[in-house]
Amino acid sequence: ESGYAQNGDLEDAELDDYSFSCYSQLEVNGSQHSLTCAFEDPDVNITNLEFEICGALVEVKCLNFRKLQEIYFIETKKFLLIGKSNICVKVGEKSLTCKKIDLTTIVKPEAPFDLSVVYREGANDFVVTFNTSHLQKKYVKVLMHDVAYRQEKDENKWTHVNLSSTKLTLLQRKLQPAAMYEIKVRSIPDHYFKGFWSEWSPSYYFRTPEINNSSGEMDPI
């Protein structure tokens, strides 16, 4: 359990930038939590570098990360989930850089899944539904979701809708007729826990109906 590297320690290493970022995932594997860290500079030579977390742990002082290619990873039940932990980059017993981080403020939810879109002919709308594993979790239950959709031909013209439920209605008249749309969704913690957006769900593709010339309404698919 060593502290910050002193000036003059590891002279060669001092030239490098060891800044890193981490995210936590709670109850990601049953009751196990995970913590993932990576260097911000992809060119850092990680050969002899290790990560260690100390403090805010249950009945242990410190835990060592496993190295998985360019990322460092812990899966454990031993997070207290309150207060700050000291996360350090180490070479042997020497700490090169350390950060104090509250793991409840760097939570990255799991990506939503089972995204689908159903057209309701009578209502002239599309019902978007998706699922999230967080509905079953003890901790990170309350999420804000970001549904993004675009016409497939519009490379970067995404429309975003934020919602707290897992169901969204898109009005047909707000969409272009006879067009192919791509839609996807991601999540972020929204109560007590703080952190980052999840990865995006796999995209779902749907086509809007043609306009029915006599009524001015779209034809169903």
């Epitope: 249950v58 410190c62 207290l80 989930l81 309150i82 700050k84």
Partner: antibody, heavy 119, light 105 residues
């Protein structure tokens, strides 16, 4: 102001159990750990364990594991320490102490509860 | 488990004198805290994270050190400073030292 108020003195027989309460006020109870520290007569301080009031997760000193149980009732901002199979050397003052999770020191202490174990 | 050894066990000094209290760890510690305890009272925090003054603590108290050796210094003893002082490591199992009693000479 931030305050921890503990239950009154107890006299117990060897082999019995004791449950000490610690009522918190003046802060968000679930935002800080609650630690328990004891002090035998004329002796130093000994950390027994802590509880995270938000989720009930506990961390115990191995010396007391199996004999001490920490619980909490968030609805009344109260933490509890129960020590079982009491022995005469458990005679001590028992303190609850709020844990500052940024720096992991005990920033606010209760007034202490004297537990006497005697046959 | 880390053992914290405080020395001296007793320090006999007069008001106005400088007090230097030592806390030695059996292996390296990242942060150390210090508490003051008077007879019949609960401990109160003095210094946290080696050198940061706890709320309401006068500037005559200071902390220093790293690795295995830490020091609490009281630059000029006031009558209310005569008490027992404990060091404590920041991490599980939050071990306390045995204490140093600062008494009036």
């Amino acid at each position: 102001q931030v305050q921890l108020v503990q239950s009154g003195a107890e006299v117990k027989k060897p082999g019995a159990s004791v449950k000490v309460s610690c009522k918190a006020s003046g802060y968000t109870f679930t935002g800080y750990t609650m630690n328990w520290v004891r002090q035998a007569p004329g002796q130093g301080l000994e950390w027994m364990g802590l509880i995270n009031p938000y989720n009930g997760v506990t961390s115990y000193n191995q010396k007391f594991k199996g004999r001490v149980t920490l619980t909490r009732d968030t609805s009344i901002s109260t933490a509890y320490m129960e020590l079982s199979r009491l022995r005469s050397d458990d005679t001590a003052v028992y303190y609850c102490a709020r844990g500052d999770g940024n720096y992991w020191y005990h920033d606010v202490w209760g007034q202490g509860t004297t537990v006497t174990v005697s046959s | 488990e880390i053992v914290l050894t405080q020395s001296p066990a007793t320090l006999s000094l007069s008001p106005g004198e400088r007090a230097t209290l030592s806390c030695s760890a059996s292996s390296s510690v990242t942060y150390m805290h210090w508490y003051q305890q008077k007879p019949g009272q609960a401990p109160r925090p003095l210094i946290y994270e080696i050198s940061k003054l706890a709320s309401g603590i006068p500037a005559r108290f200071s902390g220093s050190g790293s690795g295995t050796d830490f020091t609490l210094t009281i630059s000029s003893l006031e009558p209310e400073d005569f008490a027992v002082y404990y060091c404590q490591e920041w991490n599980y199992p939050y071990t306390f030292g045995g204490g140093t009693k600062v008494e009036i000479k």
